[in-house]
């Protein structure tokens, strides 16, 4: 049925009184300025809100900050600006919130020009108290927490020094100078690039990649001629300048940089770039930019070593280095990713993969939608999703696509239905099966969020006019009910709910404007009384993910296994609850050739599932280097797709070949490696 507030589908009775009793307003008594909001910890209910206001004076800009804290999911806020001595906080550094439930917060303050160093405010008790610490350097970046130990902090200074603290920012030590980029790896390891001569920019392509595993006591140079590096899953990547020219190649390590292999990816020139789109412990999605200012490139997917790559998607939209791409991991269903391609006619189209980049297709047209003006055939068209690129182009798209791991199968996004993305005002669409089928959910642009692991979806209109109505659905977006949360409409700027979609609270943020003043205001609504009871076994039904044809014996098989989930029935109005854990049951599938990718030196001819040897390796770019040495590679031409769990069935056995590889990269052969100690 078409989206709307149909009387027939009013699931929740007498909700107005229940919600009215659970609606809390807070007016922030400062001028509008800008506002940033951070959640501190998981299930703590603690929110920090930082408002900043710039007053441009004749000579300089005077800044004023206010800090507010809530410990009840935003129902009430307390002004705690005095805890940070009424200091102006630098919003470009944001609020550095510690990992997991550490309760740690670091705020970076603005200090006057002549000071020796910067200033931070530190809290380790969920922002109940703050300690002021003056730094021996001026920070260039936000403080970075070690994922393993939240007491270990890392920062780069404006002078390119690498600073480390082992006691949550109390004491700092400069462990290296001339540092361009630094990142935490696993086990409190730090990776960083250094320049020898001029600067980061001047030495680009001549940087060295270093590693310290003991917070700066000792170092190991693990790469030279480095352009940049990145971490993804268990992979460490470095782009390395070639000897002969200005091109560079990707090298990959799975042992923290002790040994490297050259990735079987095209080299790129000065104006091009590589980008890790997504990575996990199994594999990597890598974007390789096309030559020239095309705005697109190619997506490649890796094998389990990060070495052999299969072409996944051509003409992948990615504007410039650090620019915009629509690549989105649909976290509510395994193997699903959505992105955009730039077609030959320069229109932008959405593509989806259900098998981790193996195949890409257009999104199925929603049953309750008509094809728009971009469609040549009014009966045949697709759904196209607005994501980062549309937002960057200032289209009327307030939010990127949304999915949550604990709201199985649900994807919500703005989109249009036609042959390509339309610049017309978009509508909101929902899929309840991870992107296979879609339904128009709401007319026009909205802010939306998922609560209670999918038990409730809430939305507010994105409008230039003030609003006072919130919409909610308890059946995965099929039917909507509306609640007037205030008599006096506000200019809404968004919705805020605790990350992880387990909360029952939603905050509507916005501002009120009167003749002389404008003030920030938030309305927090607790939906706990709408879902009066806890869900029981009878409230769930069994669902097979990735099902497309029940008559196919292997229906639902993706990457070698199928998964059945217990999903909340659409008719059940009950609480999944904070402790809800997705119940799923995997079953292994039989192997087919689809479960294998072609190994080094082999390829799949068009429309063929068999891997054939590249004819005498002629005309193929096979510069390939394993562990920095020339050596033999033995292969039978097939390699199981990373993360594939199939068993039995097809086992592609053929004689094992020895492929002589040529190692044309002089990137760090083992004898060049050196270690240093502080």
């Amino acid at each position: 049925s078409a989206p709307g507030e149909d009387e027939e589908c009013g699931r929740v009775r007498d909700f107005v009184a229940k919600l009215a009793n659970n609606t809390h307003q807070h007016v922030f008594d400062d001028l509008r300025g800008s506002v940033s909001l951070s959640w501190v910890g998981d299930s703590t209910g603690v929110i920090l809100v930082l408002t900043t206001f710039h007053v441009p004076l004749v000579i300089m800009t005077f800044g004023q900050s206010k800090l507010y804290r809530s410990e009840d999911y935003g129902k009430n806020f307390k002004d705690i600006t005095d805890l940070i001595n009424n200091t102006f906080i630098r919003t470009e550094f944001g609020m550095a919130i510690g990992p997991e439930n550490s309760g740690k917060v670091v705020l970076t303050a603005e200090v006057s020009g002549g000071s020796r160093g910067g200033r931070i405010f530190r809290s380790s008790d969920f922002a109940k108290n703050f300690v002021q610490t003056d730094l021996p350097f001026h920070p260039l970046t936000q403080m970075m927490y070690s994922p393993q130990n939240s007491d270990y902090l890392l920062a780069l200074s404006t002078e390119n020094g690498l600073w480390v603290s082992k006691n949550f920012g109390g004491k700092w030590e400069e462990i290296h100078k001339a540092v361009c980029l630094a990142k935490w790896g696993s086990d409190n390891t730090i990776f960083f690039t250094t320049y020898a001569n001029g600067s980061c920019k001047a030495d680009l392509g001549a940087l060295e990649l270093w590693r310290t595993s003991d917070l700066g006591k000792s170092f190991k140079t693990i790469g030279v001629k480095i352009y940049s590096f990145g971490l993804g899953g268990r992979f460490l990547f470095a782009s390395v300048m070639a000897d002969k020219d200005t091109t560079r190649r990707i090298h990959v390590s799975t042992d923290q940089g002790d040994t490297w292999s050259m990735a079987q990816l095209p080299s790129v020139g000065q104006e091009q770039f590589y980008s890790i789109l997504a990575a996990n412990d199994d594999m990597v999605f890598m974007h390789v930019d096309e030559p020239g200012d095309t705005g697109f490139g190619t997506i490649f997917t890796s094998d389990d070593r990060g070495i052999v790559y299969s072409k996944s998607l051509d003409r992948h939209l990615y504007t410039t280095t650090g620019g915009e791409t629509d690549f989105t991991n649909v976290t509510s269903l395994r193997g699903v990713y959505i992105t955009s391609v730039l077609s030959e006619d320069n229109s932008i189209q959405t593509m989806i993969t259900f098998d981790q980049g193996g195949r890409w297709t257009h999104l199925r047209k929603p049953e309750n939608s008509e094809c728009d003006a971009t469609a040549k055939n009014k009966n045949e068209c697709s759904l196209h999703i607005h994501a980062s690129y549309s937002i960057s182009q200032k289209l009327n798209v307030p939010m990127a696509p949304l999915s949550e791991p604990n709201a199985v199968g649900i994807v919500i996004a703005h989109g249009s239905v036609g042959d390509a993305i339309s610049v017309m005002v978009p509508d909101v669409y929902i899929s309840d099966d991870g992107g296979y089928s879609w339904t128009k959910m709401l007319e026009g642009p909205h802010y939306y969020t998922i609560l209670d692991s999918g038990g409730i979806i809430v939305a507010i209109e994105h409008s230039s006019r003030p609003i006072n109505v919130i919409k909610f659905s308890t059946d995965e977006g099929q039917c909507w009910q509306t609640y007037t949360f205030t008599r006096d409409p506000i200019y809404a700027t968004g919705l805020a709910s605790e990350p992880g979609a387990r909360s029952m609270n939603i905050s509507i943020w916005g501002f009120t404007e009167s003749f002389l003043t404008s003030q920030w205001v938030s309305y927090t609504i607790d939906f706990k009384d709408i879902l009066e009871r806890n869900c029981e076994e009878k409230d769930y039904t069994i669902w097979l993910a990735h099902s497309t044809d029940p008559e196919d014996y292997e229906d639902g098989c993706i990457l070698g296994y199928k998964e059945q989930f217990l999903r909340l029935r659409k008719s059940s109005v009950c609480q999944n609850g904070r402790d809800y854990v997705v119940t799923k049951q995997p079953s292994i599938c039989l192997c087919s050739l689809e479960d294998f990718l072609c190994d080094f030196g082999y390829y799949r001819p068009e429309n063929d599932s068999k891997c054939v040897e590249q004819p005498e390796l002629k005309g193929h770019d096979l510069e390939f280097c394993l562990y920095g040495r020339e050596e033999h590679l033995t292969t039978n031409g097939y390699r199981k797709i990373p993360g594939d769990k199939c068993q039995g069935g097809v086992n592609p056995v053929r004689e094992v070949k020895d492929l002589k590889k040529k190692c044309t990269s002089n990137f760090l052969s083992p004898e060049k490696q050196n270690s240093k100690s502080n």
């Epitope: 009878k538 069994i542 029940p550």
Partner: antibody
Framework: QVQLVQSGAEVKKPGSSVKVSCKAS????????ISWVRQAPGQGLEWMGG????????NYAQKFQGRVTITADESTSTAYMELSSLRSEDTAVYYC?????????????????WGQGTTVTVSS | DIQMTQSPSTLSASVGDRVTITCRAS??????LAWYQQKPGKAPKLLIY???SLESGVPSRFSGSGSGTEFTLTISSLQPDDFATYYC????????FGGGTKVEIK
Amino acid sequence: QVQLVQSGAEVKKPGSSVKVSCKASGGTFRNYAISWVRQAPGQGLEWMGGIIPIGGWANYAQKFQGRVTITADESTSTAYMELSSLRSEDTAVYYCARQGRKTGYYYYYGMDVWGQGTTVTVSS
Amino acid sequence: DIQMTQSPSTLSASVGDRVTITCRASQSISSWLAWYQQKPGKAPKLLIYKASSLESGVPSRFSGSGSGTEFTLTISSLQPDDFATYYCQQADGHITFGGGTKVEIK
């Protein structure tokens, strides 16, 4: 064409158990839920429960919880329904039926294939 | 569990008549409703699934409509073969059937 063939009629004493089988042929048994529905003489249809052969996930109507056990054997494409502590009110025709499926949901699309029914008579 | 109330319980009609049977759910079930036809001594036969989708092989004189809590099965022109008992069944909760509607010759 999919067919469901059920075991023959049974006469049982009160307090005993009955186990009815339902063998599928001509389709992918494992990918569909099998429901069990009964019909007492002159009465309407009553759903007892169902099972999904993959993983053996069974669920039961509240009324029969604890008294009915539904199982499936993928290797023989057979589903079973066992009803214990029989009483005279359990005298009925017992049907197995395949739940039609158009999406990943097993129970939402109606029962498109039915067995011929098994008459169970409970009498002392 | 969700209760299904079917009406009427008996309906007398003649060949060629337009017949409408109603089914009401105790709570909203979206479109998850099926209709069956059963003849004496036979297993039920699926006519309609998802409230309005016609099962393959079923004559087009049968149609279903409704969503939420109110549903109808319509036989546009009753044929001799259509005299039987009709059941609705909801699928968005533990499955429950309506009490049945017997369509008999007037």
